[in-house]
Structures are given as structure tokens and as C-alpha cells.
């Protein structure tokens, strides 16, 4: 706490300007009117205040707005935002995307801090859903943002917002997250033609079921190996050699190089050796010719 001391004569601030950087902490506390500060917040960023001086300015705003700052002030916080705690931010009601952008800009280039996470959470909850413009903004600042959400949170993303998602935004998503996002992407891109559809849906295919992969295999898509290896193992296993060959096109040749990695390894073990031989890759480990394959899971379901 800064002690309440009277402002020396002639030092009362009439506006927020560079002369204030020469004020001691107690002088700032005594001589800067909180209401003046609030109306001239946009000037604070242009003045090289010390961290200690910024603490005093924050303290003045906290006194003026004990229930939380109004958006007119929040939008112009600038570097003062870095002084805010998650508890401070929880009191705010941020509704403008411009305000969100202004504050994210301050933290640009850094990891997502607890303050930023709280700000985003407040903003999204206030909007009710993660709309396209918000998603555009958030992924521009934090490409991994989408994958930081839980499957439950992702379920509130409307299909229309999926258009804003770039492939790199999904790099760190796990299968549970893609399970939620894939049906939304399928819905969002449903009116596109074959090749355009594949380009858009490709990044989401880690959530695709077997039936959809079978359908894609009929469309000459030439899926690359990196995409294939991100598919759900349980979705890949039922695919036949012919279907995988059609799905991957020329990239099927790379299966040899990745035969020890999932899901390639598990898929190979499920195929007839005769069928694998048709790929012309020397793949080994398939079911020997003449063996009968029993699907025990089907048998259990019947009994």
C-alpha cells in the first residue's frame, strides 16, 4: 500500500504526459487523479514508466473501479495488462473483439499466460460460443489454441467457425479433440467438390471413422503418408489393401519405410500376405495364405 500524502503544490497532473516519469511513486499516487488516468489510458503506453510506477497506476484504477474496469479502460490498458492478475480479469466484462485483439497484441510472441487464458475464457463465455471471428483472432495469436480446449469446450464451436481453422492450428490436437472437430468440419465443407473438400478436411481426418475413409478411397485423393499415420488406428484396421492403395495413391510406396510405426504396423498384421504382395513393396507380416481369420469380437457379440 502506498501511503496517502498530499500532492506538492504545482505538481497536480493536468494530463497524462511524459513529465510523470520523473514523479516518485508517492507523488504519482498523490498527484494523478484516477478519473483523469481512466480517460487518458491510451497515453500511458507511449510513456516509459517503470514497473513500480505502473504498479501505482494500477492501484489507482483498482480504487476507482473495485468491481472491475469498464471496457473503455480495458481496451487501452496496453502494457498495464501485464500487471493484471487472473483475479482482476475475472471481474471484467469484455465483449469487443477489438479489445481482445489489443490485449493479445501486448502479450504477442509469448506463451499463453494465465492472464491471457482467463481473458479468453471470459470473452468466449460472454459470447456464448466460439464464433468464426473470435477463432480467427485467437488462432492468429496462438496457433495451438484450439487444441488447448477440452472436447467439451470444443463441442460449443459452431461448424461455421471451422472455416477459420488452418492445418497448423490442429498440430497438437489429440484424437479425442479431433473426434469432436471432424464431424463439424464434415458439415462445414459438405458442399465442396471432391479435391477441394479433401484439401480442407485433410487436417481433421484424425477423427474420421472407417466408413468415411472408405468413401475417400473412391475419390482419387492421394492422401500423404503423414496424414495417413495420424488416422485413428481403429478406423484404419478394417481397410482392405485395395482401399489403402486407392486412398494413398502414389504415397502407398512409403508404407515400407513406416512399416514399424502405428497404424501401419497394426494394419499390415491384419492383411493377407497375398494382398500385401500386390503393393510391390516387399511388406512382410501379413496373414499367411490358407489361414482362416476369425473375428472373435463378432463371436462375443453373438453369444
Amino acid at each position: 500500500e502506498v501511503e496517502k500524502t498530499a500532492c506538492p503544490s504545482g505538481k497536480k497532473a493536468r494530463e497524462i504526459d511524459e513529465s510523470l516519469i520523473f514523479y516518485k511513486k508517492w507523488e504519482l499516487e498523490a498527484c494523478v487523479d484516477a478519473a483523469l488516468l481512466a480517460t487518458q489510458m491510451d497515453r500511458v503506453n507511449a510513456i516509459p514508466f517503470t514497473y513500480e510506477q505502473l504498479d501505482v497506476l494500477k492501484h489507482k484504477l483498482d480504487e476507482l473501479y473495485p468491481q472491475g474496469y469498464p471496457e473503455s479502460v480495458i481496451q487501452h490498458l496496453g502494457y498495464l495488462f501485464l500487471k493484471m492478475s487472473p483475479e482482476d480479469i475475472r471481474k471484467w466484462n469484455v465483449t469487443s473483439l477489438e479489445t481482445l485483439k489489443a490485449l493479445l497484441e501486448v502479450n504477442k510472441g509469448h506463451e499463453m499466460s494465465p492472464q491471457v487464458a482467463t481473458l479468453i475464457d471470459r470473452f468466449v463465455k460472454g459470447r456464448g460460443q466460439l464464433d468464426k471471428d473470435t477463432l480467427d483472432t485467437l488462432t492468429a495469436f496462438y496457433p495451438g489454441y484450439l487444441c488447448s480446449l477440452s472436447p467439451e469446450e470444443l463441442s460449443s464451436v459452431p461448424p461455421s467457425s471451422i472455416w477459420a481453422v488452418r492445418p497448423q492450428d490442429l498440430d497438437t490436437c489429440d484424437p479425442r479433440q479431433l473426434d469432436v472437430l471432424y464431424p463439424k468440419a464434415r458439415l462445414a465443407f459438405q458442399n465442396m467438390n471432391g479435391s477441394e473438400y479433401f484439401v480442407k478436411i485433410q487436417s481433421f481426418l484424425g477423427g474420421a471413422p472407417t466408413e468415411d475413409l472408405k468413401a475417400l478411397s473412391q475419390q482419387n485423393v492421394s492422401m500423404d503418408l503423414a496424414t495417413f499415420m495420424k488416422l485413428r488406428t481403429d478406423a484404419v484396421l478394417p481397410l482392405t489393401v485395395a482401399e489403402v492403395q486407392k486412398l494413398l495413391g502414389p504415397h502407398v510406396e512409403g508404407l515400407k519405410a513406416e512399416e514399424r510405426h502405428r497404424p501401419v504396423r497394426d494394419w499390415i498384421l491384419r492383411q493377407r500376405q497375398d494382398d500385401l504382395d500386390t503393393l510391390g513393396l516387399g511388406l512382410q507380416g501379413g496373414i499367411p495364405n490358407g489361414y482362416l481369420v476369425l473375428d472373435l469380437s463378432m463371436q462375443e457379440a453373438l453369444s
Epitope: 492421394s222 500423404d224 503423414a226 499415420m229
Partner: antibody, heavy 115, light 113 residues
């Protein structure tokens, strides 16, 4: 050791076709795909396409789709590439190369298109 | 198509020197599932066919001298010859096998004083 043998030169007239061969030895021919690559004098390398010798499936670079036709003869472990409607732009060295990494290259055939 | 850009286009060094050449791709060549980069380096000596030196960006082909060192990931790759020998006079090409059509870099011509 593993070898891919190609004839040294082919001299052909503009508008004609030529069929280049690539004879493989000392490995299982049907266990590796065969690729074809074009190299013009003093220029880089261009991938033409590939063929799966086991079932004859072919894949082409869009640029060469109407120019090259890839085939194989399993009985003689030989891959072929036919080039049609030849022009001076097709004058180049053509290589066959084995497998995903192109771990073995053919000796190369120099095709000269001239009247 | 993935564009491969090599630099420098040529370089002249003396025997025993270390040489570094670069290859950049227009998109990532990393398969994050297997952590493999689908990039190969080839050497082509004058009047000869190309020869595989390195695959998966850093795995040396058997029989290739250990002075040839491949490194890099994603979009930026490097081939180093730690101590150049007279027989290394050649063109060096990188190639991506991440997607079709396969594409090659324009090459780096290594000349030796």
C-alpha cells in the same frame, strides 16, 4: 550387386516415339517400385512418374501425363518408358531409379530428338 | 507442388575444408507420427548417374563416407561435408518424397581448387 541397366543413347526424329528400357538385376523386381527421372543438359532433375511392378499400377507427374507411358515385363525384370510425339524439349538423359528413396539409379539413356 | 530451393548454386573450396549446403522446402516434410523428414540428398559426379547419400534428412546410406552429414527438420535442411576430398567434386541435389510429384532442388555444384 543391384544394377539397373539402360541403353546408352537413342536418336529419334521429331514427332516419333521411343521406348526406353531399364533392366533390373540382383534383387526381387516386384518388391520395389520403379521411378523415371528426366535431366536436361546443365539442368536439374524432374520426376516423370512411377510404376508398381507387382500389379502394373502407374502414377505420373501431371506434366508428363500425355508424354510418358510406363510399363513392366516381370518375366524379364525390365521396366519400360515410352515417350511419344517427341520434340527438341524431350532431348535429355532419362534415368530409372529404384524404390522410395531412389537408392539405386540406372546408367541413364541419352535421348536426342533431331531431324 | 512442393518447391525445393537449394543454396548456394555453386561453391569452390579446397581439399580438407568443411562445406555446408542448404535445401529449403515450401512446406514441412516432417511426418510428426514417426518423426521422420521425407528428404533425401544425392550426389552426381560429372558424366555419372546420381547416387543416394542421405535419406530421412539424416540417415546415411550404407557405404557413404561419414564425412557426409545430413541434418535439419521441417522446411530447412543442410548437407555438410566435414572435410572435402578431391573425389567429392559433383553436383548435389535434395529431393522431397513427402508428396507427389516428387520434386528436386536446383542443385549445388561443388568445385574443388
Amino acid at each position: 550387386q543391384v544394377q539397373l541397366q539402360q541403353p546408352g543413347t537413342e536418336l529419334v526424329k521429331p514427332g516419333a516415339s521411343v521406348k526406353l528400357s531399364c533392366k533390373a538385376s540382383d534383387y526381387t523386381f516386384t518388391s520395389y517400385w520403379m521411378h523415371w527421372v528426366k535431366q536436361r543438359p546443365g539442368q536439374g532433375l524432374e520426376w516423370i512418374g512411377s510404376i508398381n511392378p507387382s500389379n502394373g499400377d502407374t502414377y505420373y507427374n501431371e506434366k508428363f501425363k500425355n508424354k510418358a507411358t510406363l510399363t513392366v515385363d516381370k518375366s524379364s525384370s525390365t521396366a519400360y518408358m515410352q515417350l511419344s510425339s517427341l520434340t527438341s524439349d524431350d532431348s535429355a538423359v532419362y534415368y530409372c531409379a529404384r524404390g522410395w528413396y531412389f537408392d539405386v539409379w540406372g546408367t541413364g539413356t541419352t535421348v536426342t530428338v533431331s531431324s | 507442388d512442393i518447391v525445393m530451393t537449394q543454396s548456394p548454386s555453386s561453391l569452390t573450396v579446397s581439399v580438407g575444408q568443411k562445406v555446408t549446403m542448404s535445401c529449403k522446402s515450401s512446406q514441412s516434410l516432417l511426418n510428426s507420427s514417426s518423426q521422420k523428414n521425407y528428404l533425401a540428398w544425392y550426389q552426381q559426379k560429372p558424366g555419372q548417374s546420381p547416387k543416394l547419400l542421405v535419406y530421412f534428412a539424416s540417415t546415411r546410406e550404407s557405404g557413404v563416407p561419414d564425412r557426409f552429414i545430413g541434418s535439419g527438420s521441417g522446411t530447412d535442411f543442410t548437407l555438410i561435408i566435414s572435410s572435402v576430398q578431391a573425389e567429392d567434386l559433383a553436383d548435389y541435389f535434395c529431393q522431397q518424397h513427402y508428396s507427389t510429384p516428387r520434386t528436386f532442388g536446383g542443385g549445388t555444384k561443388l568445385e574443388i581448387i
